[in-house]
């Protein structure tokens, strides 16, 4: 009669939770049989990043430090369950975290977009269109932002017109302006659960242009044009 | 990147046996169980079993229990399946994956032909 | 075992419609299920796992859902490169089983 390792009820073990989930939150348990009937000790190998501690009689599997989506989902431990007495016997499964998103990532700005000019004085109003991302998951759809000016005062001379959930169009009101640099505030909304909203700014230069690019006196860098 | 290399054919004769490979890369190959799965023409996948390569643990389908061998070197990050007294009927595509939830990762498949 | 009834066996939709294929088990599997696409002469490709969890890089427009023994893959606004065959899998306990697929057309 050859004493067996205990056996796992699940080929692997799976849990859904949120991310935001309280310190000392149950996220999880895993379950496994002793052919003898042996009494069984469960522990975690290969918890790298500190996250959970498993109760050893029960196999309940708590959280122990804030966890975090964007590390990287589902994130994977290896269970053991070791007979206790007998042979001491072991067997491995695996015990798969997932972490559902929450909105903690306010939006941002998709690229560097310093460099944006107009060449100086402006025949027509001109415009000049800007993306936005965050770093949350967005499930079965894209983010869809919302764009407004940063500031009331900037009303007189911007406006700001969203194209879809990501892009936007920033248009000048008029023709009538400075020979210098304008930092235009945007405030783009995600429009989640919490809403988060992130004020960005662009830098556009009105500037005198020499074969389509800002003319700078030498020392100057010139800019490129990004409209 | 994750690959999973596999031969893209093996050609046997009734009765005899093959062992096919099936090489990864861009991983850990000792952290990642591994998979192998069987399909014949016009047919759905069936699960032949899986390895742990760091413990060298095989788990069987009862079905090709006296059929497949599931071996890991992992000095050469190769997982191996050997099929024995072989017929027609394991003529088939067999892929080797990675186990994550589900196989995150396949091979490209070897086309094993048994035939005289 | 652990069956996997999937439906329908084949499916044609023209591109920009919404497609649904379901898979029942034979016993409650918990959402241990993902489902797979599978291109002719690729390798199969894992679309969702855990129920309604989409694998990292695979179109917004893929959505499972379902639990207990009725699960549902969904494509919206279908695209020609979606031809391919179909499967779910559960993992909840060996033996793994698969659907026996569907094969899904571009009229």
């Known amino acids: 009669d050859v004493n067996e390792a205990p056996q796992f009820s699940q080929h692997v073990f799976q849990a859904k939770v949120s991310e935001d989930v309280a310190i000392g939150t149950k996220v999880g348990n895993v379950t496994a049989k002793d052919p003898e009937g042996l009494d069984i000790s469960y522990s975690l190998r290969g918890d790298t990043r500190g996250w959970l501690k498993i109760d050893h009689v029960t196999g309940e599997i708590f959280s122990v430090a804030p966890l975090d989506r964007e590390a990287g989902s589902p994130y994977r431990v290896q269970v053991v369950a070791t007979e206790v007495g007998g042979s001491s016997l072991s067997s491995v499964s695996e015990f798969h975290l997932i972490l559902m998103d929450v909105n903690d990532n306010p939006p941002r700005l998709a690229k560097d977009y310093t460099g944006l000019f107009f060449c100086h004085p402006l025949s027509a109003p001109g415009s000049l269109i800007f993306e936005a991302t965050d770093d949350d998951q967005h499930l079965f759809r894209g983010p869809h932002f919302t764009f407004s000016l940063g500031s009331g005062s900037l009303q007189n001379d911007w406006e700001v017109s969203k194209i879809n959930g990501t892009h936007a169009r920033l248009s000048t009101r008029h023709t009538e302006f400075e020979e210098r640099e304008y930092v235009v505030l945007i405030r783009i909304n995600d429009g989640g659960r919490p809403p988060l909203e992130g004020i960005v700014s662009l830098p556009v230069t009105f500037c005198s242009c020499v074969e389509g690019s800002c003319f700078r006196p030498a020392g100057h860098k010139h800019h490129h044009h990004h409209h | 990147q994750v690959q999973l290399q596999q031969p893209g054919a093996e050609l046997a004769k009734p009765g005899a046996s093959v062992k096919m490979s099936c090489k990864a890369s861009g991983y850990s190959f000792s952290s990642y169980w591994m998979h192998w799965m069987k399909q014949r023409p016009g047919q759905g996948q069936e699960w032949i079993g899986y390895?742990?390569?760091?413990?060298?643990?095989?788990e069987y389908n009862q079905k090709f229990k006296d059929k497949a061998t599931l071996t890991a070197d992992k000095s050469s990050s190769t997982a191996y399946m050997q099929l024995s007294s072989l017929t027609s009927e394991d003529s088939a595509v067999y892929y080797c994956?990675?186990?994550?939830?589900?196989?995150?990762?396949w091979g490209q498949g070897t086309t094993l032909t048994v035939s005289s | 075992d652990i069956v996997m009834t999937q439906s329908p066996a084949s499916l044609s939709a023209s591109v920009g419609e919404t497609v649904t294929i379901t898979c029942r088990t034979s016993e409650n599997i918990d959402s241990y299920l993902a489902w797979y696409q599978h291109k002719e002469g690729k390798s199969p490709q894992l679309l969702v796992y855990a129920a309604t969890v989409l694998a990292d890089g695979v179109p917004l427009r893929f959505s499972g859902s379902g639990s207990g023994t009725q699960y549902s893959l969904k494509i919206n606004s279908l695209q020609s490169e979606d031809v391919a065959r179909y499967y779910c899998?559960?993992?909840?306990?060996?033996?793994?089983?698969f659907g026996s697929g569907t094969k899904l057309e571009i009229k």
């Open positions: 390895i742990n390569p760091s413990t060298d643990y095989t």
């Open positions: 994956a990675r186990s994550r939830l589900g196989f995150d990762y």
């Open positions: 899998q559960h993992y909840y306990r060996t033996p793994l089983t």
